[in-house]
């Protein structure tokens, strides 16, 4: 169960979807991808305070134990809950192909 | 594709499964769980250096962009790749029940 969406740290500080513009060179793809030349990469960034967007029971446990043992147990982490597919025009041995990747762009985020 | 399992930071420093002993009180479960009194919580802890146990393409992108923009893009994070189920004897309005939880104990870990 997705828990509270209210960020106690202030607007935009907690785990949410961000867009980062990146070139093929930035991504290290220039040698095998032809297009797009630039990608609007959606990724999950932000803090995961107590019970904020807790993905599951494990995240809730992690929050509790982090409170008790902050040096041993890290806080939950902001990661993709699901992905949007994306196509790349990529080089092959014989030319090019259009390839779909299902795990490239974050669609929404949760804490785990 | 799960990438390299060699930790460049030294043995045990990178993302892996850890066991943390926790009481019902530690977990905040004392008011609704009867048994077990103590749980061996398995969780994912450790650093995620470049391409170490990268869960998918998104994790690889995150590594590349973190290297370029460390203040904007965080490094990948060590999270469960799968879970082991666990049963709890929990209090109900009428007595107790045996309930299985599928998302409580980490089974193995990856970086995302």
């Amino acid at each position: 169960a997705r828990n509270g969406d209210h960020c106690p740290l202030g607007p935009g500080r907690c785990c949410r979807l961000h867009t980062v513009r990146a070139s093929l060179e930035d991504l290290g793809w220039a040698d095998w991808v032809l297009s797009p030349r630039e990608v609007q990469v959606t990724m999950c960034i932000g803090a995961c305070p107590s019970q904020f967007r807790a993905a599951n029971m494990h995240a809730q446990i992690k929050t509790s134990l982090h409170r008790l043992k902050p040096d041993t147990v890290p806080a939950p982490c902001c990661v993709p809950a699901s992905y949007n597919p994306m196509v790349l025009i990529q080089k092959t041995d014989t030319g090019v192909s259009l390839q779909t990747y299902d795990d490239l762009l974050a669609k929404d985020c949760h804490c785990i | 594709a799960r990438n390299g399992d060699h930790c460049p930071l030294g043995p045990g420093r990178c993302c892996r499964l850890h066991t943390v002993r926790a009481s019902l009180e530690d977990l905040g479960w004392a008011d609704w769980v009867l048994s077990p009194r103590e749980v061996q919580v398995t969780m994912c802890i450790g650093a995620c250096p470049s391409q170490f146990r990268a869960a998918n393409m998104h994790a690889q992108i995150k590594t590349s962009l973190h290297r370029l923009k460390p203040d904007t893009v965080p490094a990948p994070c060590c999270v469960p790749a799968s879970y082991n189920p666990m049963v709890l004897i929990q209090k109900t309005d009428t007595g107790v029940s045996l309930q299985t939880y599928d998302d409580l104990l980490a089974k193995d870990c990856h970086c995302i």
Epitope: L34, S35, P36, P85, M86, V87, L98 | -
Partner: antibody, heavy 118, light 107 residues
Framework: QVTLKESGPGILQPSQTLSLTCSFS??????????VGWIRQPSGKGLEWLAH???????YFNTALKSRLTISKDTSNNQVFLKIASVDTADSATYYC??????????WGQGTSVTVSS | DIVMTQSHKFMSTSVGDRVSITCKAS??????VAWYQQKPGQSPKFLIY???YRYTGVPDRFTGSGSGTDFTFTISSVQAEDLAVYYC?????????FGGGTKLEIK
């Protein structure tokens, strides 16, 4: 596998609006980088690109025809629509829709024939 | 708009011959030219991307080259099934534009 199929009225009269539908399967218009384009071909002549629409709803049009063209999509039903206003006999052609991945048009429909006649 | 010109409307060749079709852009399009094949009664088929990259499944007898304004599409050994019209298209900028087509006839 990827398939596209165009449908239209077949025959219509000058000054009417031509409405075309492209129904497709095997890909999704919610995928980053994917679009659907419309191209036409008058009988015995060459290809003319008309318009395309992207996954993010960005739209591009043939310069000469821009004022008469409308393109839209229904992502959940895998359909793209093209409307051409105020048709005349010069709009008689076979109309194709094609799947696009960025600047590749790799799969084309079989085409639908449109005749404008009074 | 960028104008794509295929100077030969028709080209005649024999099975086994090498044939080259040219296409000229009205301005520099870098390598952003695609080639399509349209057989009689069929829809166009995508062959070449970005001047020289063969698309998945396209036989290796089909090649493309060129950059800037001058582009060439070559069939190294013509087969009977290559009877078709071949179109170049610039994908450098919208509006995308096609050449007028070159009809390959088999002697």
């Amino acid at each position: 596998q990827v398939t596209l199929k165009e449908s239209g009225p077949g025959i219509l009269q000058p000054s009417q609006t031509l409405s075309l539908t492209c129904s497709f399967s095997g890909f999704s218009l919610s995928t980053y980088g994917i679009g659907v384009g419309w191209i036409r071909q008058p009988s015995g002549k060459g290809l003319e690109w008309l318009a395309h629409i992207w996954w993010n709803n960005n739209k591009y049009f043939n310069t000469a025809l821009k004022s008469r063209l409308t393109i839209s999509k229904d992502t959940s039903n895998n359909q793209v629509f093209l409307k051409i206003a105020s048709v005349d006999t010069a709009d008689s052609a076979t109309y194709y829709c094609a799947r696009m991945g960025y600047d590749i048009m790799d799969y084309w429909g079989q085409g639908t024939s449109v005749t404008v006649s009074s | 708009d960028i104008v794509m010109t295929q100077s030969h409307k028709f080209m005649s060749t024999s099975v086994g011959d090498r044939v080259s079709i040219t296409c000229k852009a009205s301005q520099d399009v870098n390598t952003a030219v695609a080639w399509y094949q349209q057989k009689p009664g069929q829809s166009p088929k995508f062959l070449i991307y970005s001047s020289s990259y063969r698309y998945t499944g396209v036989p290796d007898r089909f090649t493309g080259s060129g950059s800037g304004t001058d582009f060439t599409f070559t069939i190294s050994s013509v087969q009977a099934e290559d009877l078709a019209v071949y179109y170049c298209q610039q994908h450098y900028s919208t509006p995308w534009t096609f050449g007028g087509g070159t009809k390959l006839e088999i002697k």
